[in-house]
């Protein structure tokens, strides 16, 4: 047989035995001559070296470039390929020689007392056990142990080839520790060398350190690091650790295999590094490496060792947090410390507890921030070992987009008497205060809510053409007053007023307020009527359980058929303050009311009386009158607000105070409630009587004690009472110093 590429100038070496396969008996002599056209060499089986004493290669006597290979007394192990080749080329001629040795039918490798076969557990893979034969047509089976199993060639996936060995699917022998080939010759059994079966997996999936990060200790504490490697089945693992202080006396390493569930396709290995008493030199990077030979996977973690327990705030700790009403606010407590500190939050000195609106932990979270959340928050960190404390104050400022108070108070459908001067007001509450409040207007008929026009809840006016109030052409003459600032319900508000000099035209007015976090607007329907007029007796805003009368007055010569109605539920869910007028066109939404008619010389007066007004009586009341001549209906609408009865409350605390004789004390007691409560002062539970030194002002809200004397010392009580009860606050005034003797004494 010839091997190699044909050369232009060289013919293949020529062998004296012109066969691919030669079969000879053991103990005979093998002699092959090789001739060629340049220097030749021989290669033979097993160690294929020129150092084998039994093999003799000699130059031929009858010519150049000729070599004869001789092996006297051949044995089975001489079976194999004999190759003659030109030096430095691939050109070669090969003959395969079988040395039939029935006492040793398998060729043994010189270096092998036993062999190794690597296999992978894979249904599709086959493995070759290299038990080559010195006889080509042997009857060979494969024995595997333990338990003992025999595999016989099946003409398919199990086969034996004398030049190659025994081929078998690897999974069939993956259980075995060792295998060998066996040949039967004349009822005699012959065995090959033993082959150790090594099942080899490949992949290391991952290496995980536990704890994985944020490991902090103080000097003397114990460090325990677990390193887990997850691998394919049949993978072996060497663990290796790298750490800062390699010369550690107290270091302990334990490696073990972890149990995995049966049927699992995975193996787990664990290596545990323990350092009993860490020192500062143990601080640093700890790396665990898992090595299988075919792969390496590593993972690292940083271990921080502190000299002693400590606590401090991190540099990123905020001092000012700004938020808008309704937002979620998160204030993290950024700290450095070991061990992790206990964290406590306070607001204006009062401890905060977690509930559904606020979570006070590592992060202070206010779910939906409101104005009342404005204030100073103190976070106190306490080291659990040393009890060292650190505190930090965070100011929370809650911004409020502009809110217009009248939006919910003033009726959308109030009517205004023709020719009168009217003042429209927008009272704006915003934090920070609005940087501007602008007024706009447009004619009512340009913005009538016709059924044909699409009206949405968010935009109930189908009109867009708002005009600046400076341009009042075709409308009412307007003047915008300078903004006023007022303390209303304890809040600083901005009041913008627009004066309509003469109510001649029905129009819509809009005020728009803007600050840094948003905008607010209010649309006022300014419906001008020449019809009846409504007044309230005795008060603009009654309190519940009080009585009120709504008077509708109309000129008897112009109008007839005066009727009181109450505006019923809206057909559309339209926002308060956003329904254009008039209502006369749609009487379906009106509820007729009982009323009493009175007359004087010029007017008819229709009085609708509400005894013991309740909150349910609130709403829009319509007085309808008919023009005697044209029969046209005229409507006037008035919104009635009934104030809820509220028990007295006192805002703010009276503070205990110490004053020196001769100084003055000034304290105030602000009470709210409906009906408004009466304020009284007591000293040591006795009614406080005004005299030259004791002054009560502003409906007893403010108490002044001038030139205090020792006898002014005592318990002072402010009490606010109404029909709904009383509220009180107390404070103790201490007077220091000696009483001076007067001349009178």
């Amino acid at each position: 047989a010839s091997v190699g590429l044909p050369s232009v100038s060289l013919d293949l070496p020529r062998l004296s035995i012109q066969k691919d396969i030669l079969t000879i008996k053991a103990n005979t002599t093998l002699q092959i001559t090789c001739r060629g056209q340049r220097d030749l060499d021989w290669l033979w089986p097993n160690n294929q070296s020129g150092s084998e004493q039994r093999v003799e290669v000699t130059e031929c006597s009858d010519g150049l470039f000729c070599k004869t290979l001789t092996i006297p007394k051949v044995i089975g192990n001489d079976t194999g390929a004999y190759k003659c080749f030109y030096r430095e080329t691939d050109l070669a001629s090969v003959i395969y020689v079988y040395v039939q040795d029935y006492r040793s039918p398998f060729i043994a490798s010189v270096s092998d007392q036993h062999g190794v076969v690597y296999i992978t557990e894979n249904k599709n893979k086959t493995v070759v056990i290299p038990c080559l034969g010195s006889i080509s047509n042997l009857n060979v089976s494969l024995c595997a142990r333990y338990p003992e199993k025999r595999f016989v060639p099946d003409g398919n996936r199990i086969s034996w080839d004398s030049k190659k060995g025994f081929t078998i699917p690897s999974y069939m022998i993956s259980y075995a520790g060792m295998v060998f080939c066996e040949a039967k010759i004349n009822d005699e059994s012959y065995q090959s060398i033993m082959y150790i079966v090594v099942v080899v997996g490949y992949r290391i999936y991952d290496v995980v350190l536990s704890p994985s990060h944020g490991i902090e200790l103080s000097v003397g504490e114990k460090l325990v690091l677990n390193c887990t490697a997850r691998t394919e089945l049949n993978v072996g693992i060497d663990f290796n650790w790298e750490y800062p202080s390699s010369k550690h006396q107290h270091k302990k390493l334990v490696n073990r295999d972890l149990k995995t569930q049966s049927g699992s396709e995975m193996k787990k290995f664990l290596s545990t590094l323990t350092i009993d008493g860490v020192t500062r030199s143990d601080q640093g990077l700890y790396t665990c490496a898992a090595s299988s030979g075919l792969m390496t996977k590593k993972n690292s973690t940083f271990v921080r060792v502190h000299e002693k327990p400590f606590v401090a705030f991190g540099s990123g700790m905020e001092s000012l947090v700004e938020a808008t009403v309704g937002e979620r606010v998160r204030i993290p407590a950024k700290y450095l410390g070991y061990p992790p500190p206990e964290i406590k939050w306070y607001k204006n000195g009062i401890p905060l507890e977690s509930n559904h609106t606020i979570k006070a932990g590592h992060v202070l979270t206010i779910m939906e921030v409101s104005e009342r959340d404005t204030g100073n928050y103190t976070v106190i960190l306490t080291n659990p070992i040393s009890k060292e404390k650190q505190s930090h104050v965070v100011s929370l400022v809650v911004y409020v987009p502009p809110q217009i108070g009248e939006k919910s108070l003033i009726s959308p459908v109030d009517s205004y008497q023709y020719g009168t001067t009217q003042t429209l007001t927008c009272t704006v509450y915003a934090i920070p205060p609005p940087h501007h409040i602008h007024w706009y207007w447009q004619l009512e008929e340009e913005c009538a809510n016709e059924p044909s026009q699409a009206v949405s809840v968010t935009n109930p006016y189908p009109c867009e053409e708002w005009r600046s109030v400076e341009d009042f052409q075709g409308g009412n003459k307007i003047e915008v007053n300078k903004n006023q600032f007022a303390l209303i319900e304890g809040k600083n508000k901005t009041v913008s007023t627009l004066v309509i000099q003469a109510a001649n035209v029905s129009a819509l007015y809009k005020c728009e307020a803007v600050n840094k976090v948003g905008r607010g607007e209010r649309v006022i329907s300014f419906h001008v009527t020449r019809g009846p007029e409504i007044t309230l007796q005795p008060d603009m805003q009654p309190t519940e359980q009080e009585s009120v009368s709504l008077w509708c007055t109309a000129d008897r010569s112009t109008f007839e058929n005066l009727t009181w109605y109450k505006l019923g539920p809206q057909p559309l869910p339209i926002h308060v303050g956003e329904l254009p007028t008039p209502v006369c066109k749609n009487l379906d939404t009106l509820w007729k009311l009982n009323a009493t008619m009175f007359s004087n010389s010029t007017n008819d007066i229709l009085i609708m009386e509400l005894k013991n007004a309740s909150l349910q009586d609130q709403g829009d009341y319509v007085c309808l009158a008919q023009d005697r001549k044209t029969k046209k209906r005229h409507c006037v609408v008035r919104q009635l607000t009934v104030l809820e009865r509220v028990a007295p409350t006192i805002t703010g605390n009276l503070e205990n105070q110490t004053t020196s004789i001769g100084e003055s004390i000034e304290v105030s007691c602000t009470a709210s409630g409906n009906p408004p409560p009466q304020i009284m002062w007591f000293k040591d539970n006795e009614t406080l009587v005004e005299d030259s030194g004791i002054v009560l002002k502003d409906g007893n809200r403010n108490l002044t004690i001038r030139r205090v004397r020792k006898e002014d010392e005592g318990l002072y009580t402010c009490q606010a009472c109404s029909v709904l009860g009383c509220a009180k606050v107390e404070a103790f005034f201490i007077i220091e110093g000696a009483q001076e003797k007067t001349n009178l004494e």
Epitope: K125, Y202, L294, M295
Partner: antibody, heavy 116, light 107 residues
Framework: EVQLVQSGGGLVKPGGSLRLSCAAS????????MNWVRQAPGKGLEWVSA????????YYADSVKGRFTISRDNAKNSLYLQMNSLRAEDTAVYYC?????????WGQGTLVTVSS | DIQMTQSPSSVSASVGDRVTITCRAS??????LTWYQQKPGKAPKLLIV???SLQSGVPSRFSGSGSGTDFTLTISSLQPEDFATYYC?????????FGGGTKVDIK
């Protein structure tokens, strides 16, 4: 700098022996699996042998099994390949390689020529 | 052993060309495929692991894709320094085996 520097190649007769060395620097040698890969002249790459970090697990290609021995000395940051009973078909450039998920760092290679 | 077959065995291309090399495994290897670049007289250099993860420092014009048995290495715009031989290697089952290589040379 992470590197592997090889030595020990050369010409050897069929049946002869040779020992290749690979010196590691710039990384923690004792943590890594190491491998030998060879490349016959003008041919592709062939994996030869592997050894785990503490030498507990050793593997060989069928073509070299029983003739080649891989070893390492972590104290000297060195990897070795002892090659016995060399054959003409062992002629190749031998590379040592560090292995992570793949052969990520290679030596410069050393040529082994087996010829009489 | 798992056989890895690369195609083509060589490709001639110009600077700026898009070059695609394929590698096929004789059985499924999931995504455990690695690509190497080798220049004449030099050791191979790792380019891509797990079929598509670019090794740090490797230009983004190199990309890998595929899973199971069929894999691709793409050079989006060939640069002068990319002329080399490229090898794939499976890392799924023992022993590790390489493809025969694909030589990318100048047209």
């Amino acid at each position: 700098e992470v590197q592997l520097v090889q030595s020990g190649g050369g010409l050897v007769k069929p049946g002869g022996s040779l020992r290749l060395s690979c010196a590691a620097s710039g990384f923690t040698f004792s943590s890594y699996s190491m491998n030998w890969v060879r490349q016959a002249p003008g041919k592709g790459l062939e994996w030869v042998s592997a050894i785990s970090s503490s030498s507990s697990y050793i593997y060989y290609a069928d073509s070299v099994k029983g003739r080649f021995t891989i070893s390492r000395d972590n104290a000297k940051n060195s990897l070795y390949l002892q090659m016995n009973s060399l054959r003409a078909e062992d002629t190749a450039v031998y590379y040592c390689a560090r292995v992570t998920d793949a052969f990520d760092i290679w030596g410069q290679g050393t040529l082994v020529t087996v010829s009489s | 052993d798992i056989q890895m077959t690369q195609s083509p065995s060589s490709v001639s291309a110009s600077v700026g060309d898009r070059v695609t090399i394929t590698c096929r495994a004789s059985q499924g290897i999931d995504n455990w495929l690695t690509w190497y670049q080798q220049k004449p007289g030099k050791a191979p250099k790792l380019l891509i692991v797990e079929a598509s993860s670019l090794q740090s420092g490797v230009p983004s014009r190199f990309s890998g894709s595929g899973s199971g048995t069929d894999f691709t290495l793409t050079i989006s715009s060939l640069q002068p320094e990319d002329f080399a031989t490229y090898y794939c290697q499976q890392a799924k089952a023992f022993p590790p085996t390489f493809g025969g290589g694909t030589k990318v040379d100048i047209k």
